[in-house]
Amino acid sequence: IAAHVISEASSKTTSVLQWAEKGYYTMSNNLVTLENGKQLTVKRQGLYYIYAQVTFCSNREASSQAPFIASLCLKSPGRFERILLRAANTHSSAKPCGQQSIHLGGVFELQPGASVFVNVTDPSQVSHGTGFTSFGLLKL
Amino acid sequence: IAAHVISEASSKTTSVLQWAEKGYYTMSNNLVTLENGKQLTVKRQGLYYIYAQVTFCSNREASSQAPFIASLCLKSPGRFERILLRAANTHSSAKPCGQQSIHLGGVFELQPGASVFVNVTDPSQVSHGTGFTSFGLLKL
Amino acid sequence: IAAHVISEASSKTTSVLQWAEKGYYTMSNNLVTLENGKQLTVKRQGLYYIYAQVTFCSNREASSQAPFIASLCLKSPGRFERILLRAANTHSSAKPCGQQSIHLGGVFELQPGASVFVNVTDPSQVSHGTGFTSFGLLKL
């Protein structure tokens, strides 16, 4: 069971990143699915290595004081959402914006029907060029 | 099937990073090989988690306006090259240069004879000290 | 065999990061253990994908000239310690400090009784908020 999906620009104002099965994507079988373009949902319980990579372009003056934060989150059936991993990068002083990349990854136990998704502080800053932003998992 | 190779400084002017089976490297068997010191080639079709880590030292004034970009690329037999993953970091204002690290990783289907390699915008900025820059894969 | 542990603030002055089995941690079985809150020790020889993520907050003026470096290190029974992976990030000019995240990961052969741990240049700068700093491995 493995998946690798590609970032998709979205007009939605939500902080949850959107993904698509496009380009050189992977969706090994129907035991993992991309739901509503926003979350990877697994049908089988077990240990998974889950990862996300987010490239963004921001400028210190044009952004809030707070850093750019990417969060890998888990929603299990009948449970509250929880943060699995986070990474933070202070905004660049480069003009018009400076690109930076974040990589998140870790081993987690997922229940049947569990979904994982990626939140960012400002989705408008995310880079969607080939290979820059992606999200995936693999069952151990 | 797994490999982990270590960066090697090169006098070549190519943007493709060079690697070596040295230090604490891994080459599990002959189903994956390091070819010409630049690419990991697999003999068996399947899903692979492929990763690269690149540490570089650069200075905004001494570098081009464009960020430092590391790309993980795929070349399959009889096919065009394609980018699998990219990461970008804006140059530092630190003098003489500021170190930064990039990590790339994702799950991809590779064909028999497929090769993966790492491109960077400026190989002269790459740090080759112990553990700073490496490249590898594992078959799921 | 898999583990994922969560960073823990420590009053110790050591450069070795401290970890705990808390929050959404993973410890698949007794073939991997967290020893003294500082190292993951495996009982079985084999290839492992080992990773660490460190988020830190630092300021160029308040820090040494040297960058913030995170190192993934190996101690095998009867052998000297060795560095497996390192990543470096120059300190931010943001005030009071600028957050940055480092991700390390690679495939390594571990012997029975081998331990892996994470060193940083300044543990006081490490961020321990939910999901920011973690450490883990999985057996291939």
Epitope: - | L31, R44, Q45, G46, G78, F80, E109 | -
Partner: antibody
Framework: QVQLTESGPGLVQPSQTLSLTCTVS????????ISWVRQPPGKGLEWVGV???????LYNSALKSRPSISRDTSKSQVFLKMSSLQTEDTATYYC????????????WGQGASVTVS | DIQMTQSPASLSASLGETVTIECRTS??????LAWYRQRPGKSPQLLIY???RLADGVPSRFSGSGSGTQYSLKINSLQSEDVASYFC????????TFGGDTKLELK
């Protein structure tokens, strides 16, 4: 659902060029590669060549430079031209879809019978 | 080019029996091997790829094994719809080549 349909002339004269069309539905030519495979009467299968999803091509070197594969993605069609036909080229010609990212053929057309005479 | 040798050329078996078809290659193909079934008058159908991975929709009575230059296809509990020709194919390098068929019939 996934469908591949071969079409072309059933009879070709020796030394002439064979032109076959494979029309597909239910999937995109930019996601899957398409191979041409032929089967002489009562014999086994022979791979002719492939049109990759990225537009590149590769051919069986045993057929020299006689095959040429092209496509029209807007019409979901892949074309095979084979020059200098001889009687031993008499066969059923199949187009087959490649499993995404994999070198195996997971869906086949019904085949087009070609006689060189 | 890699040569593919299939055996037997033909075999007959009864319903419910287990049959095995062998495929030998002229060099190591690193498990890059597929099996196809071709029913009379029909086009080929993918059964197994990567030596032992079942294709979508293929019943679990089919299984594959092997490594190096020796591979086999096993059909448990033979059904009437399994009367067909069977081909192995390697895709370790180019050109891809197929084995000569094995014709399976009912006793």
């Amino acid at each position: 659902q996934v469908q591949l349909t071969e079409s072309g002339p059933g009879l070709v004269q020796p030394s002439q060029t064979l032109s076959l069309t494979c029309t597909v539905s239910g999937f995109s030519l930019t996601s899957h590669h398409i191979s041409w495979v032929r089967q002489p009467p009562g014999k086994g299968l022979e791979w002719v060549g492939v049109m990759w999803n990225d537009g590149g091509t590769l051919y069986n070197s045993a057929l020299k430079s006689r095959p040429s594969i092209s496509r029209d993605t807007s019409k979901s069609q892949v074309f095979l031209k084979m020059s200098s036909l001889q009687t031993e080229d008499t066969a059923t010609y199949y187009c087959a879809r490649g499993k995404m990212h994999y070198y195996v053929l997971d869906a086949w057309g019904q085949g087009a019978s070609v006689t060189v005479s | 080019d890699i040569q593919m040798t299939q055996s037997p050329a033909s075999l007959s078996a009864s319903l419910g029996e287990t049959v095995t078809i062998e495929c030998r290659t002229s060099e190591d193909i690193y498990s890059n091997l597929a099996w196809y079934r071709q029913r009379p008058g029909k086009s080929p159908q993918l059964l197994i790829y990567d030596t032992n991975r079942l294709a979508d929709g293929v019943p679990s009575r089919f299984s594959g094994s092997g490594s190096g230059t020796q591979y086999s296809l096993k059909i448990n509990s033979l059904q009437s719809e399994d009367v067909a020709s069977y081909f192995c194919q390697h895709y370790s390098n180019f050109p891809w080549t197929f084995g000569g068929d094995t014709k399976l019939e009912l006793k």
